[in-house]
Amino acid sequence: MGSSHHHHHHSSGLVPRGSHMLEEVQLVVEPEGGAVAPGGTVTLTCEVPAQPSPQIHWMKDGVPLPLPPSPVLILPEIGPQDQGTYSCVATHSSHGPQESRAVSISIIEPGEEGPTAGSVGGS
């Protein structure tokens, strides 16, 4: 990968560095619940209160995705290979990386009911 991240997982889904808790990194998924028809588009938005804006990288199933940094991850033309859990990592010069909660992205075939929540291991 372009860069490797070492994450200390925390029950809140954050990756705090140092002794104080940092403001949460919010991950918003559209469509809500993260379930989409094959070929559909999912948009993940990483909202970070910190100023100036930190660099945002993306993870899938705990592994960094080889994508340019961006606060928004657009996943078009979703297929079976893209199902999994996604999270964002915010890196700020003044402290280490913070990881968001993970959201589950899944494909729903026509006629199926999608999950009610797309959150995995934390809120």
């Epitope: 990968m1 372009g2 080889p66 961006s70 078009p76 290979q81």
Partner: antibody, heavy 120, light 107 residues
């Protein structure tokens, strides 16, 4: 339909710079990435880097970090690669390709290529 | 960087013959591999994505498969337009890397 139209061939002097364009049409420019690839005459393909037109974020092959600058203009749906301090090693065809973070979208569509010739 | 070792570099075959091209990855790339076709005029077209998924409009004689770190492109019955260049591409991690290419020639 998706199209990536690249600018025409360039003949440039050593030590100068050149800017190659890749105009996208037929899709939402901000929703996809643009990759840049180099092919020397009679040789294989080499990945230069990628830009997210929506955020402006880039990643480069270390080999091209100084050589290549990637930019995108959202208003014209056009991506650019600027190559600086040109030498004969930069003589090549440069391709852009449309990509995204999903398997089905990775390097799915390619421009026709732009030949850059560096010669005194 | 991940090395993609492509073989053979050139291959002579006859119309109707079945051929396979192989790329070996130096590190784990999962299913993050494409096969590309390049025409003599330089035009590049993707044939296979994610190791084995066929692009729309690509003839069914093309197929992709994986065995461990070896990735194969198979053409079940060669047609005249297939005698061009082929490349594999891994997009599992930066920097993305290509195989060195296979030139398919008519016997």
């Amino acid at each position: 339909q998706v199209q990536l139209q690249q600018s025409g061939a360039e003949l440039v002097r050593p030590g100068t710079s050149v800017k190659v364009s890749c105009k996208a049409s037929g899709y939402a420019f901000n929703n996809y990435l643009i990759e840049w690839i180099k092919q020397r005459p009679g040789q294989g393909l080499e990945w230069i880097g990628v830009i997210n037109p929506g955020s402006g974020g880039t990643n480069h092959n270390e080999k091209f970090k100084v050589k290549a600058t990637l930019t995108a203009d959202k208003s014209s749906s056009t991506a650019y690669i600027q190559l600086s301090s040109l030498t004969s090693d930069d003589s090549a065809v440069y391709f852009c390709a449309r990509s995204a973070g999903t398997a089905r979208a990775r390097f799915a569509y390619w421009g026709q290529g732009t030949l850059v010739t560096v010669s005194a | 960087d991940i090395q993609m070792t492509q073989s053979p570099s050139s291959l002579s075959a006859s119309l109707g013959e079945r051929v396979s091209l192989t790329c070996r990855a130096s590190q784990d790339i999962g299913s993050s591999l494409n096969w590309l076709q390049q025409e003599p005029d330089g035009t590049i077209k993707r044939l296979i994505y994610a190791t084995s998924s066929l692009d729309s409009g690509v003839p069914k004689r093309f197929s992709g498969s994986r065995s461990g770190s070896d990735y194969s492109l198979t053409i079940s019955s060669l047609e005249s337009e297939d005698f061009v260049d082929y490349y594999c591409l891994q997009y599992a991690s930066f920097p993305f890397t290509f195989g060195s290419g296979t030139k398919l020639e008519i016997k």
